[in-house]
């Protein structure tokens, strides 16, 4: 069950819940946003204060890391399995250092299995964080510091830090280096969402959340 199921079962308070996949005993702890946009959102990524190192290995991005109450990555394997069982939407919520907020909403999101390096698939972009997708389309394989699956000679994950669906290297990286206020401009390896804030701006906060499309 995901956060949408948790919500429907009567738990309507934000917080960390234990989720499971259908036909599986494997459990994962995730933060559920039960308030935003009707609730039922499973948070798959959060950046807010730089407390967690996101320059991690393939295996760490596969199983997840961090603290579900704070900064964390839920795990590519869980997200892949979840998003291949039914149709999910992806909402990416962004905060800058000047108090502005924006979002990108994709009406269909899923990750391929590990066989294809958790390649990202996205359709139907709306929202305020840019009319063009800052995640390259068609989607690319996921890369980490020890798994160079991008399309650049430069090894994007090592150069820009963090695991992401790099192209060569592409217009976004929400898992880049966390830079504090007044150190967040002209940073090529920061937390980037190009079609909202440009190439050198490193964001204050990001949340990636998913929910079944028929919620």
């Amino acid at each position: 069950r995901d956060c949408a199921e948790v919500f429907k079962s009567g738990h309507t308070t934000n917080g960390v819940y234990t989720l499971t996949l259908p036909n599986s005993t494997e459990e994962v702890k995730a933060y559920c946003d039960m308030e935003a946009g009707g609730g039922g959102w499973t948070i798959i990524q959060r950046r807010e204060d730089g407390s967690v190192d996101f320059q991690r290995t393939w295996k760490e991005y596969k199983v997840g890391f961090g603290n579900p109450s704070g900064e964390y990555w839920l795990g590519n394997e869980f997200v892949s399995q979840l998003t291949n069982q039914q149709r999910y939407v992806l909402k990416i919520h962004l905060k800058d250092w000047e108090g502005n907020e924006a979002y990108s909403l994709y009406e269909h999101f899923y990750l391929s299995s590990e066989e294809l390096n958790y390649r990202i698939h996205l359709k139907g972009l709306t929202g305020t964080a840019g009319k063009i997708s800052s995640i390259s389309q068609p989607g690319n394989d996921f890369s980490t510091k020890d798994a160079d699956n991008d399309k650049c000679i430069c090894k994007c994950s090592q150069m820009l830090t963090g695991g992401w669906w790099f192209d060569a290297c592409g217009p976004s990286n929400l898992n880049g280096m966390y830079y504090p206020q007044r150190q967040n401009t002209n940073k090529f390896n920061g937390i980037k969402w190009y079609y909202w804030k440009g190439s050198g701006y490193s964001l204050k906060g990001t949340t990636m959340m998913i929910r079944p499309a028929d919620f």
């Epitope: 590990e114 066989e115 294809l116 068609p138 690319n140 798994a147 991008d150 650049c152």
Partner: antibody, heavy 120, light 107 residues
Framework: QVQLVESGGDVVQPGRSLRLSCAAS????????MHWVRQAPGKGLEWVAI????????YYADSVKGRFTISRDNSKNTLYLQMNSLRVEDTAVYSC?????????????WGQGTLVTVSS | DIQMTQSPSSLSASVGDRVTITCRAS??????LAWFQQKPGKAPKSLIY???NLQSGVPSQFSGSGSGTDYTLTISSLQPEDFATYYC?????????FGQGTRLEIK
């Protein structure tokens, strides 16, 4: 420099088994995925199988699935291909190739190959 | 499976010529394309990956381009050592598949 040296090729009868080896040197073997690719006499290249850097994932071409098994011993810097239930159409030069990363599905270095002939 | 079709299947050219080999995929492969060179009795040599990235040590007369289903390998000025067979390879999905090869001969 990167070196990949295959061995174990032989002439065998249909239905029999054979194990190929690929000895790797000049790089950190345990950090790279590895592939087997084959080339039938006078024909083009055919991908056979991949094994991830740590042996956690293995994928095969349909033509060999269920008959061939790819494996590796990172302590010995060696890649293997166990070939069972061999068929005449498996006759080819078998080469190992290093994946560009742990799982990128493209190659940067190849071995010279070892010839497998399946004939009655 | 994704079919890769190379053209021409063979080509005669002279030293100094500019040569283009094309590769067409049966479906879009989002630039997950590599090129190899093979000489008789030798191991294939990797030239290009991700459509246009030169492998380390590959001379700059080689270049690649393309998108979607159509890709090209260009040799800007043929050198004597460039006469060989060239293969394209898609790695967008499994199974990994190759083109049938283009044999480049001396005119």
């Amino acid at each position: 420099q990167v070196q990949l040296v295959e061995s174990g090729g032989d002439v065998v009868q249909p239905g029999r088994s054979l194990r190929l080896s690929c000895a790797a040197s000049g790089f950190t073997f345990s950090s790279y995925g590895m592939h087997w690719v084959r080339q039938a006499p006078g024909k083009g290249l055919e991908w056979v199988a991949i094994i991830w850097y740590d042996g956690s994932n293995k994928y095969y071409a349909d033509s060999v699935k269920g008959r061939f098994t790819i494996s590796r011993d990172n302590s010995k810097n060696t890649l293997y291909l166990q070939m069972n239930s061999l068929r005449v159409e498996d006759t080819a030069v078998y080469s190992c190739a290093r994946d560009f990363s742990i799982s990128s599905r493209h190659f940067d270095y190849w071995g010279q190959g070892t010839l497998v002939t399946v004939s009655s | 499976d994704i079919q890769m079709t190379q053209s021409p299947s063979s080509l005669s050219a002279s030293v100094g010529d500019r040569v283009t080999i094309t590769c067409r995929a049966s479906q879009a492969i989002n630039n997950y394309l590599a090129w190899f060179q093979q000489k008789p009795g030798k191991a294939p040599k990797s030239l290009i990956y991700a459509t246009s990235n030169l492998q380390s040590g590959v001379p700059s007369q080689f270049s690649g381009s393309g998108s979607g289903t159509d890709y090209t390998l260009t040799i800007s000025s043929l050198q004597p050592e460039d006469f060989a067979t060239y293969y394209c390879q898609q790695y967008y999905i499994y199974p990994i598949t190759f083109g049938q090869g283009t044999r480049l001969e001396i005119k």
